[in-house]
Every structure is written in structure tokens, then in C-alpha cells.
């Protein structure tokens, strides 16, 4: 009967990776991650899911928690137990038949009439099981999400299993297997679903390809749509000329008229449902793209872009509290202090560490190139619509940072914000930048949940100084219409360039129906929904897209003039665009967090053959998403058929090892003597949590086959990574599943499915 | 072909553990998604829970705290623990490729009976 | 404990039309196509027939059909056949349980 099964390699941090125990996801699947040696059997956190991550399985270290690309599927809810059968098995009479005796032998399946079994024994309630994944439920917001952003945020609920909306766990409660757990539960959902025969390695799709020297390119700028308007150069006037608030002048700089100069507006939960999918995704103007945070979406999505460039040392400190400080659940807050959203996985798993050191702006007249790190939050407000101010309003700006040649690749040493969730650490690979001559440009496009509504949020470092985002270009909204894709500076694979709908943001995880394969950027379209192949109804998750502007120097400084110029003190400039003046540029670029809370995408319909196949499996090594489990497997594709979803993720086996992830430590900043400075070229810090977004019924992807998101983690290990290829049903809404493991179990299920299907 | 073999007792005294290996072939347990399914003399079958193709382990919420799954790559095979039997734990015990929705390929079922 | 409800018997006549119901909820059939089908013989293992809610499974005759509407999926024979005669299983993945059966549906062939 095995039909072709798709081998859908969904790739899933396991908390092993990062040295995270069972990652025990809300719901009742303990996602038992085995690290090393499946053989271990007391590994099992959640009931369902315990993640284990064998190491031993898999060539590669299975612990490896960073993921590239997160789908965003991984979303399950925890799984409940049913103790009926087991105790209807009591009630039968105990035959004893002999050792080996088969159940053919033992005449077990000679079920007596099912009639009177039918809903009796069968119906039991399930036990306690169903837990509201926090970590998970994180997950299933938009992908991308960070923990902390999402910690932060008191509003952000974790979102259950589809019903499960804001129910978040304690922190504590999360799901254990941070790694694994999240995703686990798509990928046992996938494999629920059928486990189609996954056998081999996840494919990684065309464009699961991950760039060559990916981790160590700088391409800051691959996610810029090099048609987008970004040329402007980052800075019109120093920003302490214009008088105005620092962030404000450097906003407006960089900013691209049209674009919210803040970047960060607080995404409903259900913009994607509500956005129109169709939204032309190449639209220049953003603002009205993204959905007023007041819409009713249960949650909003901020997502925050932050673009810190790289700063000398001594502001990169101030930097690294400034993503502390500046995201909700500042780095002492604990996941539970962080708020729902970080209870996805980092329920137990260490509260993603504040992102990486974010230089303050540098001196004034100091020509210090920075690389804008770009730290896409996207925090999603809960229902209440609450959420981390902070996190609401920041707009990415792009600026162009010369690279200097003799500095040293940056590598955030601190792991991004939520990086310290053990499904997020951040590994990317330091990125050295390119030659000074090519800018790299990483521009971060603020998510937009309507052309108003944007807030902006001002980080603050430790200090409490604010850190000024140098825009940079803004990106047009059809660049980067959708708040969830934001470009995340070379380093991250290059990610489908999903021409977003400028009317609509992606959920973080909305990505599925963005990049299309065939969009430019794209690796080639991977579908990534973890599940996707499975359940194709479920978790379109669309993954943000990284985008990382092609490295060469020549489109990056096509992109933005880079001025030899020192950037004017940023601390002084303020954005004139919109609220951006809130928009606090960091130093460090290249540090992308995109946090999505759950969306709400249940209202999205994707368009069948639109873009929101997000195949693109950010690759690059430094990004981590961390995706939480998107739970897609409600959504179907209904324009393809499952038969649609045989794009195997990472176009081969992709297993993503966690070990790999952690580059930050290892990476020395290259950069002048910025050493110290987080930013990574390349968005070397580029944590990208996406929660998996389960899309429920109401959400349609765009892609035929609903969007498949290919969960690719920069690494590929052998059983680490579940393969997260869920398809999106049209019809499937996005819904958080109770525990990222069931999450990841879905996408097993889907995984399983989609093999079947091959 | 695709093929999975249970092996282990079967015959478990009560509150000891039931252990299990289901032998794969064909395919690996590393690629592919493995489930435990059992089913009770005239019941409807009971997933166990799996061990994912990405590494995870996935366990029933009503045994989780009894279950352990394990999986060795090595020998492609994936081991069921069940720990503190009781006689309702008698069933025929099923490995499969898959999870739950599109398990594929079964085991022919090994008989367990939980027994004093 | 089953969660999910199917008939407990659905009976035809050769060459009709047969159709066996899942009902489920948000959680498990209704969370996405994360539904499958289990025809099992008494004795046998149960045998795959449909994943992904409407996908055959690979020698699954084409009478043999899926759907999923809501919380409630379907398994239709178009045309019953007598070697059609089993215990249907509906399965699926359940965000809480992670994976549930039916309650099993007998079909008679008459």
C-alpha cells in the first residue's frame, strides 16, 4: 500500500540540540527528543510527543536546534491520552497465547461487531492529555515569533491547539522538548496524518538549497527585493541635524515613503485571514497592508524589525541590552515573565538569550559601517490586543553598512533574544561581509498590520537609551509587504522571496503563501509546511522569509548607497516617517527576530497558485528560526491535493542539526574592531521563532497544494529535524496546537502522509 | 519491501514491563515515522504512540507516563516499553510505518498477554 | 476512548454505495486532513485505505474514497464489493491525543 511517500525531511530543533531536555509540549504528545540513540525509552516528556532527537540516528547531530527555516507547522496540540482502549483491553477476557503469537494467531482483530464497541470504549474522553502547548501555542502564531519577543509579551497567549487560543502554560509549562517538541508535534502530525514513507533523507526542495557559504555570507540583503525601492540611501541627514528624535531622522532616511518608517504594527492574529491573500505582493506601500492592530485577530502581530548595525564594541553592550530590554521579556524575565508566547518552548528551555549585543548607534562621525541587524519581531498581541509595547512598533529600516574589510566577520556572541530557547538557538554562522565596497544592505521590512495602527516601539538598551533603527530604504511593501518576512540579512538561506501581498502581512508563518517557488530569492520553492504534504488543511505556517539581498556588492549597493560617509549619530536622529521614531535602529544588523504570536489566519484564503508556497528553507546557518509549530494540518490545500504536496522539504533530507546553530559564539566580528559587536553580517543573529500557525479551515493557502513550508534548519541532521512539509489546506485556518510537540507530531503526521503521497 | 516485525514476549505478569522491538525493513526508522498501535481482543485499536522520523517520540497521553519508545537506527529498529502492566494491557501490540493517519504498512501484530 | 465515532456496523448490498462517517472534533478530524482509513479483516492487521483524509493508499482499489468536511470524515465505497466486508477504522491525529481511532464501523456486504 505504500504509495509514494514523500520524504519530507521537517526539520525540528530538538531541545537535545541545544542540550534542552524532553521538550514536553503543552498538549498531552511528549515529543521525546532523543538525542542521541532513539534506543534511550526514558525519554519521554510528553505523552505524546517527547522529542527525542536520536543523535545516534542521525549522521547528524539531531540536537541541533537551529532552524533555518522553520515551517510554520509545527503546531500539535499535546495528545490525550486514551486510556479506554487500554482498559477495554482489561475488560477482556486475558487469553494468554503464546510468545510471538500474532494477532491473526491471538484472533485480535476479529473485533467483534464494532457495533457494540463503536462509540462505547472507543468514545472514552480523552484524559487529561490535551494540554495547551504554551511553547507550542507560541508556535502556532506566526512563525517567526521569537520566544522572547513573544515572552514578552504578557498579552501574547500561547496559542493551543486551534481552540486553544490564548491558553498559555507557564513558561515552565511549555512544552520541554524545546526542540523537538515544537515541531515534533507537526511532524508527528504529518506522519499521523500518513506517515508516508519518509524514506532517506528530507529532500531539501530547490529551493531548500541553501546558499553557498550561506552561514558565513553576508548577504545582508538577499531578502530585498532589488526592485523594491531600497536605493535610497540609508540616511538622508544625520539625524542630530534634523533635531529630530534620532530614530526619527534615521528612519525617515532610510524610509521608503509609503513604507511605515516604524515597520513594526502590530499584526491581528487573523490578519491573514483577513488580509486578502490576493494582495499583490510586490506592492510598494505597506502601510495598508498590514491589518490596524485593533482588528479583532485575537492576536496582533508586532513584528519588529530591528536593524541594529554594527556598532563598536563598546556599544554593542549596550546593544545586547537593548534587545534584552527592548523585547518584551527583557532578558531577565523569564519565560513566564515574558508572557504567553514564550512558553512555546521555552517552557522549560532557557529564555532565548537577549539578542545578541546590539551596538548603540555609533559615535556620530564615525564612519563605522554597520550592518543593520535586522530583528524582525513580529509579536503578536493577544486577543486583549495586548502586548509588549515595545515590541509593537519597530519599524526595520534598512541601512547599507559598509563592510569594512578588516573587520571580522560579526557574529553575535550573545544568542538573539529567545535564542536561548533551546529550539532557537541562534547558530548562524558568522557572516563576514562583504568587501566595503558592497554594502550589504539588509533591509528589514517593518510587518505592517494596516497602514496604521503601526506602533513603535523603541528598544531601549540596558541603559534605557533608545536604540535608533538607521532605516534603511524601506523596503516596498511589495518587497516585504508581509511583517512577517522580513529580510533577514544574507545568513539566512536565501528565502523564497515571497512578493508579499502588500495588503497582507504574512503571519510569520503565513509565509506559505508568499514565497512562491518561482518567486525571486526563493531557494527554489520548498513547500515547507511541515505537515503541509500531510495535512494539507493545516499549518500553511508561513514561514517569515529571511530575505537576504543577493551579497553581491553590486545589488546591494544598487539597493542602497552606501556612503563611506560615518553614520550620523543615530541617537540623535529621529525617524520623520510615521511612528517610526520609535523604530530604534540596532547596530549589530543582521539579528532578526520574528516573533509571530499566533495569527490568526483562519479568515486567509490563499490563492491556489499564488506564491504561498513558501518553499524557502532559510538555510542560512546563523538563522535560527525557531519555528514554532505551525499547525497547518487543518489547512488543506484545496487547490492541489495532497498529491500537490510531494515537494519534500530541504529538497532531500534535511535534517537539521542543532549543533551547527551555534555560531554566535564561534563568530568573531570581523568588522573594524567591532569584534564585540553582535551583528552578524548576514543577520548573523537571525532567531527566527516561528510559531506554527495551525490554519484552521478558514485559512486557504495560495499554493495548489496548500503552502508547504519546508522547516529547514541551517543544519541538517539525520532524526533531528522532522520534516515539516505541511500543506496548508486552502481551507485549513491557522491554529495553534495545545503543544508544539503535537505540533511536531502533526508534522510527522503530515511528513508521513506526504511520503505516502510519494 | 516494506516490512516490520514485533518481537517480545508474550507474556507479561503484571507490573512488570512490556517490552517490545519492532524490526523494520525496507525502509529506515530514520526516514519514516514508526507507530505503536495496540489493540485489545475485540477493541478498537489504540495508538501508542510513534517514534517520529525526525527523532521525536510521540506518546499517548494516557501511557505516556508508562511508555517509552526508543529507536535504534543501527538495527532499524524502534522499542515499546510499557511499563507496570495490568491485565488490560493484554492486546495484540502493532508496529507500523507511519503515525497515526496514513500508517501504511503494519506489523502482523504480536499477542501480549498481561498475565499472573 | 475512542474519539472518534463511526457506526458500529453499515451494511449494503454488492455494487452499492456505502458510505462510513467519522465524526470528530476541532482537535482531531476537524484539525486537518490528518485522517486515515483502516479496513482490517478479523485476525489481520488493519490496512491502510485512505490518508491525508482523501488520498488512496497506493493498491487501494479507486471505490475507495475519502473526504473530510468539518469535524466529520468520510469513507465511501462506491461500489461494495463482498471481499469489502471488515472492520473500518477511522484514524486520526489529534492535537490533544495525538493519535485516536474510530470506534470502528463493521460493514456487511449483503
Known amino acids: 500500500m505504500a504509495e509514494p511517500r514523500q520524504e519530507f525531511e521537517v526539520m525540528e530543533d530538538h531541545a537535545g540540540t541545544y542540550g534542552l531536555g524532553d521538550r514536553k509540549d503543552q498538549g498531552g504528545y511528549t515529543m521525546h527528543q532523543d538525542q542521541e540513540g532513539d534506543t534511550d525509552a526514558g525519554l519521554k516528556e510528553s505523552p505524546l510527543q517527547t522529542p527525542t532527537e536520536d543523535g545516534s540516528e542521525e549522521p547528524g547531530s539531531e540536537t541541533s536546534d537551529a532552524k533555518s527555516t522553520p515551517t510554520a507547522e509545527d503546531v500539535t496540540a499535546p495528545l490525550v491520552d486514551e486510556g479506554a482502549p487500554g482498559k477495554q483491553a482489561a475488560a477482556q477476557p486475558h487469553t494468554e497465547i503464546p510468545e510471538g503469537t500474532t494477532a491473526e494467531e491471538a484472533g485480535i482483530g476479529d473485533t467483534p461487531s464494532l457495533e457494540d464497541e463503536a462509540a462505547g470504549h472507543v468514545t472514552q474522553e480523552p484524559e487529561s492529555g490535551k494540554v495547551v502547548q504554551e511553547g507550542f501555542l507560541r508556535e502556532p502564531g506566526p512563525p517567526g515569533l521569537s520566544h522572547q519577543l513573544m515572552s514578552g509579551m504578557p498579552g501574547a497567549p500561547l496559542l493551543p491547539e486551534g481552540p486553544r487560543e490564548a491558553t498559555r502554560q507557564p513558561s515552565g509549562t511549555g512544552p520541554e522538548d524545546t526542540e523537538g517538541g515544537r515541531h515534533a508535534p507537526e511532524l508527528l502530525k504529518h506522519q499521523l496524518l500518513g506517515d508516508l514513507h519518509q524514506e532517506g533523507p528530507p529532500l531539501k526542495g530547490a529551493g531548500g538549497k541553501e546558499r553557498p557559504g550561506s552561514k558565513e555570507e553576508v548577504d545582508e540583503d538577499r531578502d530585498v527585493d532589488e526592485s523594491s525601492p531600497q536605493d535610497s540611501p540609508p540616511s538622508k541627514a544625520s539625524p542630530a541635524q534634523d533635531g529630530r528624535p534620532p530614530q526619527t531622522a534615521a528612519r525617515e532616511a532610510t524610509s521608503i515613503p509609503g513604507f511605515p518608517a516604524e515597520g513594526a504594527i502590530p499584526l491581528p492574529v487573523d490578519f491573514l485571514s483577513k488580509v486578502s491573500t490576493e494582495i499583490p505582493a510586490s506592492e510598494p506601500d505597506g502601510p495598508s497592508v498590514g491589518r490596524a492592530k485593533g482588528q479583532d485577530a485575537p492576536l496582533e502581530f508586532t513584528f519588529h524589525v530591528e536593524i541594529t548595525p554594527n556598532v563598536q564594541k563598546e556599544q554593542a553592550h549596550s546593544e545586547e541590552h537593548l534587545g534584552r530590554a527592548a523585547f518584551p521579556g527583557a532578558p531577565g524575565e523569564g519565560p513566564e515573565a515574558r508572557g504567553p508566547s514564550l512558553g512555546e518552548d521555552t517552557k522549560e528551555a532557557d529564555l532565548p538569550e537577549p539578542s545578541e549585543k546590539q551596538p548603540a548607534a555609533a559615535p556620530r562621525g564615525k564612519p563605522v559601517s554597520r550592518v543593520p541587524q535586522l530583528k524582525a519581531r513580529m509579536v503578536s498581541k493577544s486577543k486583549d490586543g495586548t502586548g509588549s509595547d515595545d515590541k509593537k512598533a519597530k519599524t526595520s529600516t534598512r541601512s547599507s553598512a559598509k563592510t569594512l574589510k578588516n573587520r571580522p566577520c560579526l557574529s553575535p556572541k550573545h544568542p538573539t533574544p529567545g535564542s536561548s530557547d533551546p529550539l532557537i538557538q541562534p547558530s548562524s554562522p558568522a557572516v563576514c561581509p562583504e568587501p566595503p565596497s558592497s554594502p550589504k544592505y539588509v533591509s528589514s521590512v517593518t510587518s505592517r498590520t494596516g497602514s496604521s495602527g503601526a506602533k513603535e516601539m523603541k528598544l531601549k538598551g540596558a541603559d534605557g537609551k533608545t536604540k535608533i533603527a538607521t532605516p534603511r530604504g524601506a523596503a516596498p511593501p511589495g518587497q516585504k509587504g508581509q511583517a512577517n518576512a522580513t529580510r533577514i540579512p544574507a545568513k539566512t538561506p536565501p528565502a523564497p522571496k515571497t512578493p508579499p501581498s502588500s495588503g497582507e502581512p504574512p503571519k510569520s508563518g503565513d509565509r506559505s503563501g508568499y514565497s512562491s517557488p518561482g518567486s525571486p530569492g526563493t531557494p527554489g520553492s520548498r513547500s515547507r509546511t511541515p505537515s503541509l504534504p500531510t495535512p494539507p488543511t493545516r499549518e500553511p505556517k508561513k514561514v517569515a522569509v529571511v530575505r537576504t539581498p543577493p551579497k553581491s556588492p553590486s545589488s546591494a549597493k544598487s539597493r542602497l548607497q552606501t556612503a563611506p560617509v560615518p553614520m550620523p549619530d543615530l541617537k540623535n536622529v529621529k525617524s520623520k516617517i510615521g511612528s517610526t521614531e520609535n523604530l530604534k535602529h540596532q547596530p549589530g544588523g543582521g539579528k532578526v527576530q520574528i516573533i509571530n504570536k499566533k495569527l490568526d489566519l483562519s479568515n486567509v484564503q490563499s490563492k491556489c497558485g499564488s506564491k504561498d508556497n513558501i518553499k524557502h528553507v532559510p538555510g542560512g546557518g546563523s538563522v535560527q528560526i525557531v519555528y514554532k509549530p505551525v499547525d497547518l494540518s487543518k489547512v488543506t490545500s484545496k487547490c492541489g491535493s495532497l498529491g500537490n504536496i510531494h515537494h519534500k522539504p530541504g529538497g532531500g533530507q534535511v535534517e537539521v542539526k542543532s549543533e551547527k546553530l551555534d555560531f554566535k559564539d564561534r563568530v568573531q566580528s570581523k568588522i573594524g574592531s567591532l569584534d564585540n559587536i553582535t551583528h552578524v553580517p548576514g543577520g548573523g543573529n537571525k532567531k527566527i521563532e516561528t510559531h506554527k500557525l495551525t490554519f484552521r479551515e478558514n485559512a486557504k493557502a495560495k499554493t495548489d497544494h496548500g503552502a508547504e513550508i519546508v522547516y529547514k534548519s541551517p543544519v541538517v541532521s539525520g532524526d533531528t529535524s522532522p520534516r515539516h512539509l505541511s500543506n496548508v489546506s486552502s481551507t485549513g485556518s491557522i491554529d495553534m496546537v495545545d503543544s508544539p510537540q503535537l505540533a511536531t507530531l502533526a508534522d510527522e503526521v503530515s511528513a508521513s502522509l506526504a511520503k505516502q503521497g510519494l | 519491501q516494506v516490512q516490520l516485525q514485533e518481537s517480545g514476549p508474550s507474556l507479561v505478569k503484571p507490573s512488570q514491563t512490556l517490552s517490545l522491538t519492532c524490526t523494520v525493513s525496507g525502509f529506515s526508522v530514520i526516514s519514516d515515522s514508526v507507530a505503536w498501535v495496540r489493540q485489545a481482543p475485540g477493541k478498537v485499536p489504540e495508538w501508542l504512540g510513534a517514534s517520529g522520523s525526525s527523532g521525536n517520540k510521540y506518546y499517548n497521553p494516557a501511557l505516556k507516563s508508562r511508555l517509552s519508545i526508543t529507536r535504534d537506527t543501527s538495527k532499524s529498529q524502534v522499542s515499546l516499553s510499557l511499563s507496570s502492566v495490568t491485565t488490560e494491557d493484554t492486546a495484540v501490540y502493532y508496529c507500523?510505518?507511519?503515525?497515526?493517519?496514513?500508517?501504511?504498512?503494519w506489523g502482523r501484530g504480536l499477542l501480549v498477554s498481561v498475565s499472573s | 476512548q475512542a474519539v472518534l465515532t463511526q457506526p458500529s456496523s453499515v451494511s449494503g448490498a454488492l455494487g452499492q454505495r456505502v458510505s462510513i462517517t467519522c465524526s470528530g472534533s476541532s482537535s482531531n478530524v476537524g484539525y486537518g486532513d490528518y485522517v486515515g482509513w483502516y479496513q482490517q479483516v478479523p485476525g489481520s492487521a488493519p490496512k491502510l485505505l485512505i490518508y491525508g483524509a482523501a488520498s488512496r493508499a497506493s493498491g487501494v482499489p479507486d471505490r475507495f474514497s475519502g473526504s473530510r468536511s468539518g469535524n466529520t470524515a468520510t469513507l465511501t465505497i462506491s461500489s461494495l464489493q463482498a471481499e469489502d466486508e471488515a472492520d473500518y477504522y477511522c484514524?486520526?491525529?489529534?492535537?490533544?491525543?495525538?493519535?485516536?481511532f474510530g470506534s470502528g464501523t463493521r460493514l456487511t456486504v449483503l
Open positions: 507500523a510505518r507511519g503515525i497515526i493517519a496514513g500508517v501504511d504498512v
Open positions: 484514524a486520526s491525529y489529534d492535537s490533544s491525543d495525538g493519535g485516536v
